[in-house]
Interface confidence: medium
Amino acid sequence: SQPQAVPPYASENQTCRDQEKEYYEPQHRICCSRCPPGTYVSAKCSRIRDTVCATCAENSYNEHWNYLTICQLCRPCDPVMGLEEIAPCTSKRKTQCRCQPGMFCAAWALECTHCELLSDCPPGTEAELKDEVGKGNNHCVPCKAGHFQNTSSPSARCQPHTRCENQGLVEAAPGTAQSDTTCKNPLEPLPPEMSGTMLM
């Protein structure tokens, strides 16, 4: 079998064997190596020499195999836009941001650019749990049977109604979706003379 071509190598059909790690250089009609994530092209390839790569300077990055002659500048997460950092920028990766607690992503352009406050859920409801925090605004759903939630809040969860008998008490008023059960002390037993039927 033929030996595998190592960059730089001639390409008549303008395509390269490894599209991820190589690129076509039209001036010389050759395939050259791309630079790996975290690096950039410090010297372009020629017919006799492959691409020379250098590490991105501090506070800059390149995420992909590339033939860029510069690295991208790291950008901080903008707190004014409601964003906070979850992973710092490195030479291979831009700063990872997410919406601050209590906020959701309101503007998305490849990544979140602007967060807004989550809407309150009224009493008797709670925010439906989402797969990913901060992805969308609250969708409020009613508390399930036997549960209540008595505030207007973006994050309060429905709680189970108090079971009076567990505390040695009796129910004075049943719980609703918006209020807990009201409990009271059990009535004192009636005195013996009052226990019979009263005749008028």
């Epitope: 994530p37 975290g38 501090e58 506070n59 992909h64 195999w65 990766r93």
Partner: antibody, heavy 121, light 112 residues
Framework: EVQLLESGGGLVQPGGSLRLSCAAS????????MSWVRQAPGKGLEWVST????????YYADSVKGRFTISRDNSKNTLNLQMNSLRAEDTAVYYC??????????????WGQGTTVTVSS | DIVMTQSPLSLPVTLGESASISCRSS???????????LDWYLQKPGQSPQLLIY???NRASGVPDRFSGSGSGTDFTLKISRVEAEDVGVYYC?????????FGGGTKVEIK
């Protein structure tokens, strides 16, 4: 030959302070991020802190944040770890390690021999 | 924090045979540009750790080609194709996708 040599370990009382140093040689020190990793007796490895090549970016484990400070002196090829408010759970062998890149925190490709810190009354 | 779970805890191996160590992360270590933020380290008895594999599958300088790393988003494997006596020690995986960086608990490889 690329070498890292830690020093500054010893016995210290709870609440006390200690400053670890790591002398680097055999490579362009300022071009690489550096890390501290520790290993409690009979336990696994725990990442402590990383500093970028220039010293402009620092990262810490939650368990040491606010108590430990990583720094470097590129003119002297030295990495430091200032440890304050020490606790018994900080007892460990502390390793200094070179990161493959200038300001990443992955691929620690050269390690020192370690220096032992014992926190006990 | 990302939790790294290694298995098995201990791995008795026969010289010349192959061995595999598993590492699982509590969330994906596959970054959007296609690389995996996972390192493998070996700590031989009485020695400092040494880097074997970085970015999931790249062998560090001087590491024999009998060591290979592979894996997807959350499940990773270190394979030693022909175990030699010098391969004994504790193997650790470490995620580097976000700080705090976290190690697995380690897998102790010993000769049967």
């Amino acid at each position: 030959e690329v070498q890292l040599l830690e020093s500054g370990g010893g016995l210290v009382q709870p609440g006390g302070s200690l400053r670890l140093s790591c002398a680097a040689s055999g490579f362009t020190f300022s071009s690489y991020a550096m890390s501290w990793v520790r290993q409690a007796p009979g336990k696994g490895l725990e990442w402590v802190s990383t500093i970028s090549g220039s010293g402009g970016s620092t990262y810490y484990a939650d368990s040491v944040k606010g108590r430990f400070t990583i720094s470097r002196d590129n003119s002297k090829n030295t990495l430091n770890l200032q440890m304050n408010s020490l606790r018994a759970e900080d007892t460990a062998v502390y390793y200094c390690a070179k990161v493959r890149d200038n300001w990443n925190y992955d691929g620690m490709d050269v390690w020192g021999q370690g220096t032992t810190v014992t926190v006990s009354s | 924090d990302i939790v790294m779970t290694q298995s098995p805890l201990s791995l008795p191996v026969t010289l010349g045979e192959s061995a595999s160590i598993s590492c699982r992360s509590s969330q994906s270590l596959l970054y959007s540009s296609g690389y995996i933020d996972l390192d493998w380290y070996l700590q031989k008895p009485g020695q400092s750790p040494q880097l074997l594999i970085y970015l999931g599958s790249n062998r560090a300088s001087g590491v024999p080609d009998r060591f290979s790393g592979s894996g997807s988003g959350t499940d990773f494997t270190l394979k030693i194709s022909r175990v030699e006596a010098e391969d004994v020690g504790v193997y650790y995986c470490m995620q580097t996708i976000q700080t705090p960086l976290t190690f697995g608990g380690g897998t102790k490889v010993e000769i049967k």
